[in-house]
Interface confidence: low
């Protein structure tokens, strides 16, 4: 019993003065607490607690369930205890069959003994099955058997407490161990879609999937830069023992422009946290934005091919697309396709393939697209570069030589005189008059140029060359002169 120096409060004394007492079932338990400041007796076993305000605790006919710790407390809060075993051959173990263990922690199989003098107090597997090889335990007759460092693999393990009583092995009722997994990784979070584009009034609904080893994972939808509480609904499933899934669905039944922003699904457990975001953009109405992939003014050589390409953003989805030239709609030669097969794609490509363009096929080519909210269009001005063609070359009644050429870009006409029969004309002749005939005509056709020189300046036989050229190429026509006496004759012009 405790002893302290005089003057200091001392713990109570218990009679009988032992730390443990063994009583046979049916016999009396009589415990006396000796203390001038006695307050109470307390009895504890498993989850049961009883109190007694009498300084003598008497149980006339002891039962196995009276096994436990009896504590006497005085007014100073000091206490002394005695542990009583009520030996009952028919009830060797007191049991609390609820058995939960946290992974990597110890857990107590609560099967205290009613007889401390039995041997081989241990754990056994049910139906003679062996316990896992790595399962270690520590027996304590007053408390039960502690399983050290519970493993996830022990989940649903069936076991008994066991002890040898008078040469026979006695088993307790069975226990089923339920293991609560430890979090050894952050939760896995994913979102149904990374971005949403909606019109005002449409419903926004997004689902976050949270996966972890148990349902005690915490999750919530948050809004970036806001503390506003969001309304969410949950569904959850256990796919096997340590495979838990929760779906948290956030819904805004009628989205507004000012609901636009970044929404975060956040999850955490004792190991750490994880998050995933989705972006919501709400527009007051749909839109179409067209981006030309080539210059909207196009120059192409006669006979060559050109592709007119646009990319465009359309929300909602485009419903009608067409390419138009001179009020005529193309039925073929074009294709329209989404830029990506992604479900949330809003970007598309349209291509018009113009092949072997003729000089007459220059002009405005227009792409038109519409959806349920808006229309949009873009125009390409196509110019076809053509080599000059000499349309006429004549000697006029007034003695002028005139050359008319057409092409694009606008041809330049130069004149040369070749004396005699030389074919290479080098001496240039200045024109008297140059006119662009259709400068005010249609903007995309060939440009026609007329140039004239005065033939009276030529005094010798020879050839006059009219040369029309532009960036694409050149063409020449020739006038032959022969003098008979004083008369000058124009011989057939030729190209």
């Amino acid at each position: 019993q405790p002893s302290v120096s005089p003057g200091e409060p001392s713990p109570p004394s218990i009679h009988p003065a032992k730390s443990e007492l063994i009583v046979r079932v049916g016999n009396e338990i009589r415990l006396l607490c000796i203390d001038p400041g006695f307050v109470k007796w307390t009895f504890e076993i498993l989850d049961e607690t009883n109190e007694n305000k009498q300084n003598e605790w008497i149980t006339e006919k002891a039962e196995a369930t009276n096994t436990g710790k009896y504590t006497c407390t005085n007014k100073h809060g000091l206490s002394s205890s005695i542990y009583v075993f009520v030996r009952d051959p028919a009830k060797l173990f007191l049991v609390d069959r609820s058995l939960y263990g946290k992974e990597d922690n110890d857990t107590l199989v609560r099967c205290p003994l009613t007889d401390p003098e039995v041997t081989s107090y241990s754990l056994k597997g049910c139906q003679g099955k062996p316990l896992p090889k790595d399962l270690r335990f520590v027996p304590d007759p007053k408390a039960g058997i502690t399983i050290k460092s519970v493993k996830r693999a022990y989940h649903r393990l069936c076991l008994h407490c066991s002890a040898d009583q008078e040469g026979k092995s006695v088993l307790s009722d069975k226990f089923i161990l339920k293991v609560r997994p430890a979090f050894k990784a952050v939760p896995v979070v994913s979102v149904s879609k990374a971005s949403y584009l909606l019109r005002e009034g449409e419903e926004f609904t997004v689902t976050c999937t949270i996966k972890d080893v148990s349902s005690s994972v915490y999750s919530t939808w948050k809004r970036e830069n806001s503390q506003t509480k969001l309304q969410e609904k949950y569904n959850s499933w256990h796919h096997g023992d340590f495979n838990y899934e929760r779906q948290a669905t956030l819904t805004i039944s009628s989205a507004r422009v000012n609901d636009s922003g970044v929404f975060m699904c956040y999850a955490n457990n004792t190991f750490g946290s994880a998050n995933v975001t989705t972006t919501l953009e709400v527009v007051d109405k749909g839109f179409i934005n067209i981006f030309p992939m080539i210059n909207t003014t196009v120059f192409v050589n006669d006979g060559e091919n050109v592709d007119l390409i646009v990319e465009y953003e359309a929300f909602p989805k485009p419903e009608h697309q067409q390419w138009i030239y001179m009020n005529r709609t193309f039925t073929d030669k074009w294709e329209d396709y989404p830029k990506s097969e992604n479900e949330s794609n809003i970007r598309y490509v349209s291509e018009l393939h113009l092949t072997r363009l003729k000089g007459t096929e220059g002009g405005t080519y227009t792409f038109l697209v519409s959806n349920s909210d808006v229309n949009a269009s873009i125009a390409f001005n196509v110019y076809v570069n053509t080599k000059p063609e000499i349309l006429t070359y004549d000697r006029l009644v007034n003695g002028m030589l005139q050359c008319v050429a057409a092409g694009f870009p606008e041809p330049t006409i130069d004149w040369y005189f070749c004396p005699g029969t030389e074919q290479r004309c080098s001496a240039s002749v200045l024109p008297v008059d140059v006119q662009t005939l259709n400068a005010s005509g249609p903007p995309f056709g060939k440009l026609v140029v007329q140039s004239s020189i005065d033939s009276s300046a030529f005094k010798h036989n020879g050839t006059v060359e009219c040369k029309a050229y532009n960036d694409v190429g050149k063409t020449s026509a020739y006038f032959n002169f022969a003098f008979k006496g004083n008369n000058k004759e124009q011989i057939h012009p030729h190209t």
């Epitope: 809004r223 806001s226 503390q227 506003t228 509480k229 000012n258 609901d259």
Partner: antibody
Framework: EVQLVESGGGLVQPGGSLRLSCAAS????????MAWVRQAPGKGLEWVAS????????YYLDSVRGRFTISRDNAKNSLYLQMNSLRAEDTAVYYC???????????????WGQGTTVTVSS | DIQMTQSPSSLSASVGDRVTITCRAS??????LNWYQQKPGKAPKLLIY???RLQSGVPSRFSGSGSGTDFTLTISSLQPEDFATYYC????????FGGGTKVEIK
Amino acid sequence: EVQLVESGGGLVQPGGSLRLSCAASGFTFSDYYMAWVRQAPGKGLEWVASINQNTGSTYYLDSVRGRFTISRDNAKNSLYLQMNSLRAEDTAVYYCARGDYYGTTYWYFDVWGQGTTVTVSS
Amino acid sequence: DIQMTQSPSSLSASVGDRVTITCRASQSISSYLNWYQQKPGKAPKLLIYYTSRLQSGVPSRFSGSGSGTDFTLTISSLQPEDFATYYCQQGRRLWSFGGGTKVEIK
């Protein structure tokens, strides 16, 4: 009429304490974010502290963190600023301001009180 | 912390003038910018929030524009009651105000 009225300002010595109050009326106080903004003599505006209406989370200017405490009593429609260890540079007119939000993503201050003057001087 | 720089710090203008005040943030604040007007001895008054949205009761001669780091407050035709000090304020990361622009009578 929506109104904020500050009180509790005055002259205090360096190292001293003051408690400012802001009485709100004309709106549901518990629904709004609240803040304190100050203006030193001849200077510009400086946000000091704010408190969220839903979570009770508090935010402070670095130079006042640990010395000032913002709090609210929704039952009394009141906002408070407890100022300890006051310094000369805390001398200013202190305004109580109501926070409203656009798009639930950020706050602006749409209603202001007339201000209460705090002078820290020996 | 996000620093807000206003320019000019003061300007002189006449009634009917078009006045432009600029505000620059030390880092991108998206469109989270507010403008306030303050007259001597009075509390500030909210003019514009979220860069360009006019607070209820504010005359339409006030307008705001910009995004990212550069913002502008424009008074299309200055009125006698507009002579005051104007402050910009960011709401991206906590709150900070610009140094103010005083609009005086020329």
